[in-house]
């Protein structure tokens, strides 16, 4: 099918920059400023991506391929190239309607964006808790109690807890 | 506005050799393909040579061998060297800016005036 249309159609040679001008007989014309076209044999030139507001430019347009945008400090990307910018929060927290929340007991989140997740529960491995959760971090789980040898450790193997994770205090 | 000016035609005898220059105007040159065309005295026109932007050639086959087809972008002009001309290479040569920068099965948008190449002993 490629061969074609490459044989039926007159425009399917005009190199990727330019377009195949209707208003010139089909010759083969630049592509005007601030528009480019990615592929050859295109009949029109795409408007090139304007990163404005919270977007500010990571490459700029060219002839050939649209300009891609990246977010400012503060802020994050989400979708596919970037077609929103989301609020950054610290660590410890996650971005609600109303804003940045810190996370509940018994959650954390490590990064600047993305949800509290609840701490790894060490016991359903076995495990005891070696290291406690945070806001911040999740929990570091040891080796079950029963590979310890006598005074080997001091670290208490978690009693049932109702909070996933969390050793008594 | 296109503009397409052929010069370098003229009478030279069997054997011999003329280089035609076709100057382009109007369009932006280098991303388009330019072709040359003949028509002989009581003939249709014919296709002869053809180059697109990126250099690619295509020949008719009576003219294999015998004629190449170049172009220099800087200066927006396209030439035709022919060498070991015959009588049967009369004609008036056309220069011809081609749609789609295609040279397989190409056609013509845009023509210039044409230029006068007699061969006789």
């Known amino acids: 099918f490629e061969r074609t249309r490459s044989l039926q159609d007159p425009c399917s040679n005009c190199p990727a920059g330019t377009f195949c001008d209707n208003n010139r007989n089909q010759i083969c014309s630049p592509c005007p400023p601030n528009s480019f076209s990615s592929a050859g044999g295109q009949r029109t030139c795409d408007i090139c991506r304007q990163c404005k507001g919270v977007f500010r430019t990571r490459k700029e347009c060219s002839s050939t391929s649209n300009a891609e945008c990246d977010c400012t400090p503060g802020f994050h990307c989400l979708g596919a190239g970037c077609s929103m910018c989301e609020q950054d929060c610290k660590q410890g927290q996650e971005l609600t309607k109303k804003g940045c929340k810190d996370c509940c007991f018994g959650t954390f989140n490590d990064q600047k964006r993305g949800i509290c997740r609840p701490w790894t529960n060490c016991s359903l491995d076995g495990k005891s808790v070696l290291v406690n959760g945070t806001k911040e971090r999740d929990v570091v789980c040891g080796p079950s109690p029963a590979d310890l040898s006598p005074g080997a450790s001091s670290v208490t193997p978690p009693a049932p807890a109702r909070e996933p994770g969390h050793s008594p205090q | 506005e296109v503009q397409l000016l052929e010069s370098g035609g003229g009478e030279v005898q069997p054997g011999g050799s003329l280089r035609l220059s076709c100057a382009a105007s109007g369009f932006s040159f280098s991303i388009n393909a330019m072709g040359w065309y003949r028509q002989a005295p009581g003939k249709g026109r014919e296709f002869v040579a053809a180059?697109?932007?990126?250099?690619?050639?295509v020949y008719a086959e009576s003219v294999k061998g015998r004629f190449t087809i170049s172009r220099d972008n800087a200066k927006n002009t396209v030439y035709l060297q022919m060498s070991s001309l015959r009588a049967e290479d009369t004609a008036v040569y056309y220069c011809?800016?081609?749609?789609?920068?295609?040279?397989?099965?190409?056609?013509?948008?845009?023509w210039g005036q044409g230029t006068l190449v007699t061969v006789k002993p």
């Open positions: 011809g800016l081609l749609k789609g920068n295609r040279v397989v099965s190409p056609s013509v948008a845009y």
């Open positions: 180059i697109e932007s990126g250099r690619n050639t």
